[in-house]
Amino acid sequence: RQQWELQGDRRCQSQLERANLRPCEQHLMQKIQRDEDSYGRDPYSPSQDPYSPSQDPDRRDPYSPSPYDRRGAGSSQHQERCCNELNEFENNQRCMCEALQQIMENQSDRLQGRQQEQQFKRELRNLPQQCGLRAPQRCDLEVESGGRDRY
């Protein structure tokens, strides 16, 4: 790869390391859960709670009043925070794509089934526009099999 390309990647990496993308993840998960609920899924099925503390306590947004709010009261709050974070990537389309890829990777092991994964991916692609930002033209959101390491 070109040297200047790597330099740009480093600056992007610096932003990615500093970004708190959890509100984006929470906003999207709540959105697809609500969509599923409206099709008759039991809204209180514990296995569907992607932020149940027993599953992953350290991924909770510390500013969130509750681990998960299916009714969406906190969702607009999550969306606002999410948009504030994504706004940092507005002028760098490649870096915006990497931020979206990171969100996809972080959530990939919580998405149940191909349908939910596709739905999450669709919502994720629309996220920049929802925030009034430019969406990256080409952005591969496929997650490599094997997922990611968690520590």
């Epitope: 790869r1 040297q3 790597l6 330099q7 990647d9 480093r10 600056r11 992007c12 990496q13 610096s14 932003q15 990615l16 390391e17 940092e88 002028n91 760098n92 870096c95 990171q102 990611r148 390491d149 968690r150 520590y151």
Partner: antibody, heavy 98, light 109 residues
């Protein structure tokens, strides 16, 4: 010499690893960086050709190997997490004697 | 290049350390200056104080502040405390190599 740096308490792939060295009574000298997710690396010109940075993601461990050592390489070698080096290891002392 | 090499300031007074980069560390696409300030005490690893030239790292007292853009930067310590005696380094991470300044030794007058 191969110096290791074991990460804990965070997602290893998410943050770059920097390597910095410091000779006794001297300033900080940046050696290079590695992205654990992609394996991409970048080295200071001074170390090109004799330094190699690798990682074992399954062990959350980064490695820095420095070859053809001279007494001038005697220093404490630090690994640091993140592009802007937010968290530092305690350092590994490397002594090269003739 | 950092200046001065060493500095003696009275307790409660202000300390100012300068850092000049040979090339601009400002990135227009992110609107950020990729420069950090570190504090190092004897026998300890460095500690990040300021990132992106002016953002205080979490847990760092608010008497520490960073300013500047492009090639000229300043670390200011308001109301110097005894525990601030240390060596301070700037580092640019805009482009490889991520060079450090030579360090400024801060002492109590």
């Amino acid at each position: 010499v191969k110096v290791s740096c074991k990460a804990s308490g965070y997602t290893f792939n998410r943050y770059d690893i920097n390597w910095v060295r410091q000779a006794t009574g001297q300033g900080l000298e940046w050696v290079g960086w590695m992205n654990p997710k992609t394996g991409n690396t970048g080295y200071a010109q001074k170390f090109q050709g004799r330094v190699t940075m690798t990682r074992d993601t399954s062990m959350s461990t980064a490695y820095m190997e420095l070859n053809n050592l001279t007494s001038e390489d005697t220093a404490v070698y630090y690994c640091a997490r993140g592009v802007d080096a937010t968290h530092w290891g305690q350092g590994t002392r490397v002594t090269v004697s003739s | 290049t950092q200046s001065p090499d060493s500095l003696a300031v009275s307790l409660g007074e202000r300390a100012t350390i300068n850092c000049k980069s040979s090339q601009s560390v400002f990135d227009s696409s992110s609107n950020k200056n990729y420069l950090g300030w570190y504090q190092q005490n004897p026998g300890q690893p460095p500690k990040l104080l300021i990132y992106w030239a002016s953002n205080r790292e979490s847990g760092v007292p608010d008497r520490f502040s960073g300013s500047g853009s492009g090639t000229d930067f300043t670390l200011t310590i308001d109301s110097l405390q005894a525990e601030d005696v240390a060596i301070y380094y700037c580092q640019q991470y805009h482009s490889t190599p991520h060079t450090f300044g030579q360090g400024t030794k801060l002492e109590i007058k």
